[in-house]
Amino acid sequence: TLNSVLNSNAIKNLPPPLGGAAGHPGSAVSAAPGILYPGGNKYQTIDNYQPYPCAEDEECGTDEYCASPTRGGDAGVQICLACRKRRKRCMRHAMCCPGNYCKNGICVSSDQNHFRGEIEETITESFGNDHSTLDGYSRRTTLSSKMYHTKGQEGSVCLRSSDCASGLCCARHFWSKICKPVLKEGQVCTKHRRKGSHGLEIFQRCYCGEGLSCRIQKDHHQASNSSRLHTCQRH
């Protein structure tokens, strides 16, 4: 269980005083049962550990992904785990470290030479064998072979937000993902009522920009739950 992570939960790196920024302590681990170490395949207990809970990958760092730390773990307990290096097992692109992507359950390099064909195949595979289309658009999506070598501009195909230029995030568009603008004040945003609901969106929105949060528009408070409009608002 997750709790075995915390059997020895002392923090050796004492936090700084109020307002100070802490360093990023390493993912040092010591042996013990029950926990899948984020970067590999061995069961270990994590010591000196500060679990950072999350609901989706965007809440974690660029070198992390969001998942349950135990196999078959409680969906209500998800934390940021270290990304998986090349040749490690994966279930989605975000699990693989930047410069890699998930192909056939393994993190592989997204280097320029073989990236284009493989990622095209992977995106098609990701959505199963149903080859139907929506509004005449094909599910097969080709990525530029220059990806990962320059930051994607708006509309560029991406795997994760770190592939996109500043002010953009990587969001689903049909059955691929492209760089879209981070939402500004007053723009409509999506408030996910339950974990994982964002996975159903064909046209996914970015999150609200810094200093903003996705909240119900004041004049929509009386509306029914299903019709409530959320917008990015300042605190």
């Epitope: 936090p15 109020l18 307002g19 100070g20 920024a21 802490a22 990023h24 302590p25 500060q50 950072y52 809970p53 999350c54 609901a55 965007e58 809440e59 974690c60 760092g61 660029t62 070198d63 992390e64 209500g76 307990v77 998800q78 934390i79 940021c80 994760r160 937000s161 770190s162 996910h192 339950r194 974990k195 999150y207 810094e210 200093g211 903003l212 949060s213 996705c214 605190h235």
Partner: nanobody, 125 residues
């Protein structure tokens, strides 16, 4: 820069309850995870509980699971720690911590970068 102020600590008898609060200011509260840590005299600081930015994921230390509950109110920029069935071994200074917001703020790793000054909790037997 984030500022965190804890309150709600005090002296309570074993078996009693306390509710700690941590008010945050200085950045969009709803963008980052929040955690509670504690440090008993002569011991190292240890993790107690944490909650994701959307409140959909919570995690607890073994020693407090089933007794403590973490929650947050994003509208009030406040995180809470409800502590029930308190034991003498829960005596410590309790610290509130705010995460760095992860990749949304350009970080390679999501970590607790901001800390409050702490509030004393004493449980007498």
């Amino acid at each position: 820069e984030v500022q965190l102020v804890e309150s709600g600590g005090g002296l309570v008898q074993a078996g009693g309850s306390l509710r700690l609060s941590c008010a945050a200011s200085g950045r969009t509260f709803s963008s980052y995870a929040m955690g509670w840590f504690r440090q008993a005299p002569g011991k190292e600081r240890e993790f107690v509980a944490a909650i994701s930015s959307s409140a959909s994921s919570t995690v607890y230390a073994d020693s407090v699971k089933g007794r403590f509950a973490i929650s947050r109110d994003n509208a009030k920029s406040t995180v809470y720690l409800q502590m029930n069935s308190l034991k003498p071994e829960d005596t410590a200074v309790y610290y509130c911590a705010a995460g760095n917001g992860g990749r949304k703020y350009g970080h390679h790793r999501a970590r607790y970068d901001y800390w409050g000054q702490g509030t004393q909790v004493t449980v007498s037997s």
